[in-house]
């Protein structure tokens, strides 16, 4: 199962900087359209990887003013790339009662990355506690 | 593998017109942003024109020293990059390089194409 | 316009020694802890290749007799040990606004 826990780890590594991106972006708030955007929160289990993708879908957008507007573009660039894929993300792509992204309350942009990074180290958490359980599930 | 090609260059005369093209293949293209970089003995490496991606709704931003002389444009349909360069002076001279900003620099080039502008 | 004045513009070190480049930058371009400097290579009718980026990471498929440092305005790039495909001029270049502006170069000849 070599290549197996290789695409974990690249999974674990992918997830941790999109935190730190999430992170990065939350020093430019005040330079991102305070635009109100679908912001999953308290997630229902197996529906991680849908919530994700809201994430990612939404329309997150610089300003356009001042000098940070070629960091914070790069940074939202970044955060939209795919992760490599996982067992658990594989299934939940195929999981068809998960909430639409529309349906997600909408925040403005220090809440939608607040909530992202939540998002984040829960999956973190999950792909953690499935491994020292010795699933491949997530 | 990441190819780009670029295409177009040649002698013109000062105040003349000249497009460059550039493919690009191995990658997804739509998602780029694509630079165009030229250098010089002159003026050594110098960053040109940049245009985004359809994600970005495609914004296009130039040095100050070709703005409102020169224009980037890409077809996403084709992957391919354009530089229409109009009033062209001996100072544009030099190589052309198509590059693509991944990230965090300029990770994937063109070999170049020469322009000359010389009457 | 953020300027990168790089030194020396040419040196001459021996096969397995250390040769050390600057770059500084005309004001900070580092913000929150990520300095958005990068570093190039290019040997005579080649384009330039990108080595490190950020400041520090080294680039895929780079040897890492390659290393960068610095931050805000004064940045690094060492090669240790120099070896003989190494010879070529050695460029820093910042992303941190627009435009984008390359340092002049820096020729490595070795002894």
């Known amino acids: 199962h070599k290549s197996s826990s290789q695409g974990q780890d690249r999974h674990m590594i992918r997830m941790r900087q999109l935190i730190d991106i999430v992170d990065q972006l939350k020093n430019y708030v005040n330079d991102l359209v305070p635009e109100f955007l679908p912001a999953p929160e308290d997630v229902e289990t197996n529906c991680e990887w849908s919530a994700f993708s809201c994430f990612q879908k939404a329309q997150l957008k610089s300003a356009n003013t001042g000098n940070n507007e070629r960091i914070i573009n790069v940074s939202i660039k970044k955060l939209k790339r795919k992760p490599p894929s996982t067992n658990a993300g594989r299934r939940q792509k195929h999981r068809l009662t998960c909430p639409s992204c529309d349906s997600y309350e909408k925040k403005p942009p220090k809440e939608f990355l607040e909530r992202f990074k939540s998002l984040l180290q829960k999956m973190i958490h999950q792909h953690l506690s499935s491994r020292t359980h010795g699933s491949e599930d997530s | 593998e990441v190819e780009l090609v670029e295409s177009g260059g040649g002698l013109v005369q000062p105040g003349g017109s000249m497009k460059l093209s550039c493919a690009a293949s191995?990658?997804?293209?739509?998602?780029?942003?694509m630079d165009w970089v030229r250098q010089s003995p002159e003026k050594g490496l110098e960053w040109v024109a940049e245009?985004?991606?359809?994600?970005?709704?495609?914004?296009?931003y130039y040095a100050e020293s070709v703005k409102g002389r020169f224009t980037i444009s890409r077809d996403d349909s084709k992957s391919s990059v354009y530089l229409q360069m109009n009033s062209l002076r001996a100072e544009d001279s030099g190589i052309y390089y198509c590059?693509?900003?991944?990230?965090?620099?300029?990770?994937?080039w063109g070999q170049g194409t020469l322009v000359t502008v010389s009457a | 316009d953020i300027v990168l004045t790089q030194s020396p513009a040419s040196l001459a070190v021996s096969l397995g020694q250390r040769a050390t480049i600057s770059c500084r930058a005309s004001k900070s371009v580092s913000t929150y802890g990520y300095s958005y400097m990068h570093w190039y290579q290019q040997k005579p009718g080649q384009p330039p290749k990108l080595l490190i980026y950020l400041a520090s990471n080294l680039e895929s498929g780079v040897p890492a007799r390659f290393s960068g440092s610095g931050s805000g305005t004064d940045f690094t790039l060492n090669i240790h040990p120099v070896e003989e495909e190494d010879a070529a001029t050695y460029y820093c270049?910042?992303?941190?606004?627009?435009?984008?502006?390359f340092g002049a170069g820096t020729k490595l000849e070795l002894k």
């Open positions: 590059t693509e900003y991944d990230y965090e620099g300029f990770v994937h």
């Open positions: 245009i985004r991606s359809e994600a970005d709704n495609h914004p296009t």
């Open positions: 270049q910042h992303s941190r606004e627009l435009p984008l502006t």
């Open positions: 191995g990658f997804t293209f739509s998602d780029a942003w």
